[in-house]
Amino acid sequence: EAHKSEIAHRYNDLGEQHFKGLVLIAFSQYLQKCSYDEHAKLVQEVTDFAKTCVADESAANCDKSLHTLFGDKLCAIPNLRENYGELADCCTKQEPERNECFLQHKDDNPSLPPFERPEAEAMCTSFKENPTTFMGHYLHEVARRHPYFYAPELLYYAEQYNEILTQCCAEADKESCLTPKLDGVKEKALVSSVRQRMKCSSMQKFGERAFKAWAVARLSQTFPNADFAEITKLATDLTKVNKECCHGDLLECADDRAELAKYMCENQATISSKLQTCCDKPLLKKAHCLSEVEHDTMPADLPAIAADFVEDQEVCKNYAEAKDVFLGTFLYEYSRRHPDYSVSLLLRLAKKYEATLEKCCAEANPPACYGTVLAEFQPLVEEPKNLVKTNCDLYEKLGEYGFQNAILVRYTQKAPQVSTPTLVEAARNLGRVGTKCCTLPEDQRLPCVEDYLSAILNRVCLLHEKTPVSEHVTKCCSGSLVERRPCFSALTVDETYVPKEFKAETFTFHSDICTLPEKEKQIKKQTALAELVKHKPKATAEQLKTVMDDFAQFLDTCCKAADKDTCFSTEGPNLVTRCKDALA
């Protein structure tokens, strides 16, 4: 229904705390370089204005759209052109073009320093002094680094953060209470970020139909007892929510997400038997819980998929009458039977089924033509299954760091033109799939592995799009989202690449490496490994292992030495010589 004042409506629906949080996220995601204080000032102004509209919906400007109100605020920021360059040109446009212009200027890789966590005592002091400001800083810092972060979910993570601090700051040993808990939240939030970015990429490049197909498959796996009409309704609503968040309509997105959670909890009987524990929680926890609820038990009496989609004499007639509905039904039926498949795989199978019907229904004897379609799915299913087995075996053998290194070598060989920091980031993220997925029960591994890899590769594509350097990467990133992972997996050594010349300074290290945290040490070593592969793309695994073992030994020796600087300056050149010889 239409409201006289959109801003008053959203303020009333969301309440002041969530309203302010979402407006802060919106501003931080649009203007990623502004300080917290600048954004906090704007948020307060917008909130004060919203309150005047709540008091009187007919007050001046209360009838304006949210994008007009927010955009006018952003465009009034001083020195916009000096700080943001051509983004300032957006302010010459009118709504809704101005908003979409802002959206297109979001930077997936902003040049901001890593978000450093203060030490426990300092953190607890500032949290106790002003919890609201502390959480505001958290929202701002995460949102500006992750401009597509799912806003209502970021509120959930802020709430988690708040609860952890409340609990741990009362403990004697704050550090050992905070560190593992906050590390856990950080890891989950980073995964949430890449997953949501993939959803927005899907909407941006392939539109609503592609996203809705993803939603149908995912929801059908989770709620196999819900009928097709119910799944379609949920998929439509979920598509709307995600579209709003990806489009920067964060207040509408959060409001509609709350509505969807409410609907699901009021209709558990027709959706799933597993929702009750989620539905007992408060709003943010409820919505989060529903988004990752365990799969319902599959109905015991499901007929074979072939009955309606291969053996039925009316297949081509049903397909011709309503293609989208027929294919949607196929995707629903196949997905509810296969919670053990990844969504990407299910969408590839649906695509294969569609291509088969397109071809066969134009022939003289369609049933003879499409009769073998399910058998033709086999290679499509085997490929990711083999991928999971091979990679989980390797992970179990090497551990996370070794597995990351194996992936780093593989991907540097596939796309040696890509910048070393991007390759290292990608390999570290791809390598985490082992820890995340390989320890799961067999039937959960494939969906975990492939859908996570797809999200990470989406980020690789986004970063590469900014500065395209590799034809291999361009080829894989240009196709459909569901074909990306198989495309990257199939890439081999790039034969067109001219190896980088050996530069001694790339492999020269100093004693400061000894005091770095373990993660930073790993990144330094992985940077060297990528550079080695760029120098010798066809180096064998054995050669690379020899060099890296030597390198690790060198670091260990020099970091334990009484005179570290002398050790690094004398032993370093020897290491470089040995590396060159080993790779010759």
């Epitope: 809704p96 979409e100 297109q104 927005c200 392939f206 539109g207 609503e208 139909r209």
Partner: nanobody, 125 residues
Framework: EVQLVESGGGLVQPGGSLRLSCAAS????????MGWFRQAPGKEREFVSA????????YYADSVKGRFTISRDNSKNTLYLQMNSLRAEDTAVYYC??????????????????WGQGTLVTVSS
């Protein structure tokens, strides 16, 4: 393949009305978003209005909100733009466009794969 043919343009006085039509032939289906853009001489092509074929949701540029109305007739596969209270600054060539995927950014011309040839609207006394 989709073909789009606009009609209904012409000369009208300020304050007057016009109704543009866009006949779509070929395989338009429920996932389509249809839109109207315009281009005045020496200016960039700008977004005017759009509608989702599936749910009928509409979008307007601020400059035409309250004066223009977009609508569709599914049975005739036709898109309309009712333009009231026309102003001199509405003078432009009006184009009908179709995005078969309903991509996220509906004001971006590059997201529309199919275009009509355009119809000229002149608002002058």
């Amino acid at each position: 393949e989709v073909q789009l043919v606009e009609s209904g343009g012409g000369l009208v006085q300020p304050g007057g009305s016009l109704r543009l039509s866009c006949a779509a032939s070929g395989s338009t289906d429920s996932a389509y978003r249809m839109g109207w853009f315009r281009q005045a001489p020496g200016k960039e092509r700008e977004f005017v209005s759009a509608i989702n074929w599936s749910d009928g949701r509409t979008y307007y540029a601020d400059s035409v909100k309250g004066r223009f109305t977009i609508s569709r007739d599914n049975s005739k596969n036709t898109l309309y733009l009712q333009m009231n209270s026309l102003r001199a600054e509405d003078t432009a060539v009006y184009y009908c466009a179709a995005d078969p995927d309903s991509r996220l950014y509906y004001t971006v011309p590059q997201n529309y794969d199919y275009w009509g040839q355009g119809t000229l609207v002149t608002v002058s006394s």
